[in-house]
Interface confidence: low
């Protein structure tokens, strides 16, 4: 079969499974005159052998671990053994299979881990290696935790990442791990050939000891601290520790207050720097946070609460420069005139607070003193001895004094005897008719006007006159002002009419005074009157049951995904068509007959979180009236983003020749979200051809330092590979370059001559 | 003493396809970040793509999936194949070894895009 097995000499490629026992010929090369033999040379290992004729074979099997790639060449030769063709060369590759186990670097790992640390941060990674193809599942590991000892209520404390083999804790153990109940931990980890997923895969097992250590970096309990302190500041009030020394200790305010009085010292101490005014701010929140020597943040931060402990620092305050009352002529005795309320401003049902009140006087003392009484803790006003008479004193003044346990307050009262009210509202109509409304009608709109009469004094709480409607609306649609002059009612709207739920209402008016009627009056059918308000429909959009909808996902979830839902009714019972709007990224459609969001493309919390778009919903039907509402959806961030040089660093420079190994820092960034801790990059060099001139090392999260290991560098640019790896999950890796230029300088300046460059270097090292 | 040889300029019909070449002399070439600039009437020069030592490769955007850049070590050539050209190509393009604006540049060959 001429083409497959055979052929003229040309440059091939073959690939072959190790192990494989040789059963077959790899080719057959055919000779063009004057060649008559072939002869190979190369990577043979004695294995590969080409017969005069041409045909080449191998003749044993083969092992990729020794050699994954042989480099043969083939020529051809004329009958003096002269080359004639070639060589060419002929590359056979050589297939993996499962033919090594994997084998763990360690038969015993230690390490150690501090309670509450970060669920899934590593705190120690087991290795294993495999001599199979790694990018072949033959090479591909798997690492499991096969038992954790003590096992406490059957809760794992310890989770492996089964590709990296990295150990941390787990949510539960992040929150349970206590070294005073249980000090250490051992795992057995096992790790798999075939990415874990065959039967016939290799394995081998490792021991790892775990101590757990206490972590001091707990919020204290909270403080109490009493109001208008008199002692020197800065008082401590308490303290937090970080678990090694060295820390940088800060408080951050969240709430911006204009006056933020607390420290923290460099031992972790805090103190209340002012004294605290309990009727400004009665409690404090704030957070302690621990930093490294470069800033970066060593842990979540700690919530700090002050309570502020009241003093009795407040007088009792009057409810106003005179409180006026009214009683009518033939009050009873014990009847209620009023209540006077004084305020105090110390904490509430505390002594600091709690109000007494006494009558100190009474003018005029006509008939006689001591007419009123009040409750001494409720400031209730009561009739005390006898009916009054308007004719011999129309007005009363009272000084009450008001006290809490260390105050005393005077407010002043004034009662003013009115006439009896024995008179009742009489409506000047009793049916105000028929009144027919659009339901659109605004609200506000003054419907319908209405009039009662009362025949009592003046002005007074006997001749005011308050409309209520007892009947007819009990949804509150309708309310009434009265004009305090004339006693005129005027009907207004307070909240939308709706045809659908109240096409016709029976509204029934009652009349009342605010002062009670005498003994033996009531109210009669004069003080009531009605009217019947019929509404007419109007054609309504469609409602949304929120005026906002929000719906939270993780941006890498699969296109096609239910994201959320919207739900809308029509007045007029029609049905509902959904769509979207201002959707300008294309990530969402809508279900035009349910309301379900789905997404239909990859979405991104770094383009913008919330995504926010609308949501219209249109009448079938009908006058195809719509509504719009608005749809958030929140996107949960995932590991998608690799890191990146956080700025440009073109222009970098050292002169030429360097006089020492110079190094230079740089920074890296990434566009995920980082809470409270920040990234936690680690840096490498980009490929290992650079480690002779260059060494990179990490200063702390997102800086490292890029150092030169010799001074012997031509006078030209330097492109440095850097891998800058997040350490996410799942870790992404970016790899970013670094030009670094070595040049004659002058006056601490790069200098090239002219037709080199087209800038000019900014930065020297 | 560097020098940096372009050749495979020319003149070319949108949508057409042009490779140009860049022999490198004076360098451990294997060493250097190599790449393309252009320079159009009137405008800064730019760099165009660029290829690192260990082969990775970087495009500026508007010519992102167009244009690629390769190597061959054992030649000391850096190659740029132009696919899918449009009349905006027109410039003069450099060789550039170092891989940025502060790096070596050749003399240029012309392309010129135009129906």
């Known amino acids: 079969q001429e083409g497959k097995f055979s052929g003229p000499l040309k440059p091939m490629t073959f690939s072959i499974y190790e192990g494989q026992e040789p059963s077959q010929i790899i080719f057959q090369f055919k000779a063009n005159p004057p060649a008559v033999t072939f002869e190979l040379t190369g990577e043979t290992d004695n294995i590969f052998v080409i017969e005069r004729e041409g045909l080449l074979y191998y003749n044993r099997a083969l092992d990729r671990e020794t050699r994954s790639t042989h480099n043969l060449q083939v020529a051809a030769l004329d009958a003096n053994g002269i080359i004639v063709e070639g060589p060419v060369p002929i590359t056979i590759k050589v297939k993996d299979i499962n033919d090594n186990r994997p084998t763990f670097l360690q038969s015993k790992y230690e390490g150690s881990v501090r309670q509450n640390s970060r669920p899934g941060k590593p705190f120690l990674y087991v290795n294993a290696t495999d001599l199979d193809d790694p990018a072949t599942p033959n090479g591909q590991l798997y690492y499991q935790i096969v038992i954790q000892l003590p096992m406490i209520n059957n809760v794992m404390y310890f989770q492996i990442n089964n590709k990296t083999g990295a150990i941390s804790l787990t949510r539960e153990g992040s929150q349970e791990l206590n070294p005073a109940k249980n000090p250490s931990y051992n795992l057995v980890i096992s790790v798999k050939d075939m990415g874990g997923q065959s039967e016939n895969s290799f394995s081998d097992t490792t021991s790892v000891d775990i101590i757990v250590t206490e972590n001091i970096w707990k919020a204290p309990k909270p403080v109490e601290m009493v109001e208008n302190s008199t002692d020197p500041h800065p008082i401590k009030i308490t303290q937090v520790r970080w678990n090694d020394p060295g820390a940088q200790y800060s408080l951050v305010d969240k709430e911006k207050l204009p006056r933020f009085p607390f420290s923290i010292d460099q031992e972790g101490d805090i103190y209340v720097t002012q004294p605290l005014d309990r009727e400004e701010k009665d409690a404090y929140v704030f957070y302690a946070v621990a930093k490294d020597e470069y800033g970066k943040p060593l842990s979540y931060p700690l919530e700090i609460h002050v309570k502020v402990k009241d003093i009795n620092d407040n007088p009792p305050t009057c409810p106003s420069p005179v409180t006026v009352f009214e009683v009518q002529e033939n009050e009873r005795l014990g009847n209620s005139i009023g209540t006077l309320t004084a305020h105090d401003r110390d904490e509430e049902n505390t002594a600091n607070s709690f109000l007494n009140y006494r009558i100190v006087e009474q003018t005029p003392k006509l008939p006689m003193d001591g007419l009123f009484l009040i409750q001494t803790y409720a400031g209730m006003l009561q009739l005390a001895k006898q009916s009054l008479k308007k004719q011999d004193t129309p007005q009363y003044n009272l000084t009450i004094e008001v006290s809490d346990k260390d105050f005393k307050t005077l407010c002043f009262v004034q009662i003013n005897v009115i006439d009896i009210n024995d008179q009742i509202p009489i409506f000047e109509k009793s049916d105000y008719g028929n009144l027919t409304l659009a339901e659109d009608t605004n609200i506000g709109s003054t419907i319908l006007t209405i009039q009662a009469t009362d025949a009592d004094e003046p002005f007074t709480g006997s001749s005011k006159i308050l409309y209520h409607i007892i009947k007819g609306d009990s949804e509150g649609r309708l309310g009434v002002d009265t004009d305090p002059h004339t006693n005129t009612g005027y009907v207004i709207i307070k909240k939308p009419l709706d045809f659908e739920t109240a096409a016709v209402s029976n509204i029934v008016f009652k009349a009342e005074n605010p002062e009670p009627l005498v003994f033996g009056v009531k109210y009669n059918a004069s003080s009531f009157a009605k009217f019947t308000l019929i509404v007419t429909d109007v054609n309504e959009a469609p409602q949304f049951s929120q005026h906002v909808f929000q719906a939270k996902v993780s941006e890498d979830v699969a296109i096609g995904t239910k994201v959320g839902n919207v739900t809308a009714k029509d007045p007029e019972g029609l049905d509902i068509s959904y769509s979207l709007r201002g959707d300008t990224r294309g990530w969402l459609k809508i279900d035009h007959v349910t309301g379900e969001i789905f997404s239909v493309a990859p979405l991104d919390r770094e383009a913008g979180s919330p995504y926010r778009v609308q949501v219209v919903a249109t009448e079938v039907g009908g006058s195809s009236l719509s509504s719009v509402s608005e749809f958030h959806l929140i996107l949960m961030d995932v590991n998608d983003n690799p890191p990146r040089l956080a700025k440009d660093y073109t222009g970098l420079f050292f002169c030429h020749p360097l006089s020492a190994p110079g190094s230079l820092i740089f920074e890296a960034t990434d566009d995920d979200q980082h809470l409270f801790r920040g990234p936690h990059f680690t840096f490498s060099l980009g490929s290992g051809s650079l480690q002779n001139d260059w060494e990179v090392s990490k200063i702390n999260g997102t800086h490292a330092r890029l150092s030169t290991r010799h001074t012997e560098f031509e006078e030209r640019e330097y492109v440095v590979l850097i891998r800058i790896n997040d350490g996410g999950r799942p870790p992404l890796e970016g790899i970013v370059s670094l030009p670094v230029t070595f040049c004659s300088c002058v006056e601490g300046s790069c200098f090239r001559p002219a037709g080199h460059q087209t800038g000019i270097p900014t930065v020297g090292m | 003493e560097v020098q940096l040889v372009e050749s495979g300029g020319g003149l070319v019909q949108p949508g057409g396809s042009l490779r140009l070449s860049c022999a490198a002399s004076g360098i451990r070439f294997s060493r250097y970040a190599m790449g393309w600039g252009r320079q159009a009437p009137g405008k800064q020069r730019e760099l165009v793509a660029s290829?690192?030592?260990?082969?990775?490769?970087n495009y500026a955007d508007s010519v992102k999936g167009r244009f690629t850049i390769s190597r061959d070590n054992a030649k000391n050539t850096v190659y740029l194949q132009m696919n899918s050209l449009r009349p905006e190509d027109t410039a003069v393009y450099y060789c550039?070894?170092?891989?940025?604006?502060?790096?070596?540049w050749g003399q240029g060959t012309q392309v010129t895009v135009s129906s």
């Open positions: 550039n070894a170092g891989g940025g604006a502060l790096g070596y």
């Open positions: 290829i690192f030592i260990d082969d990775t490769t």
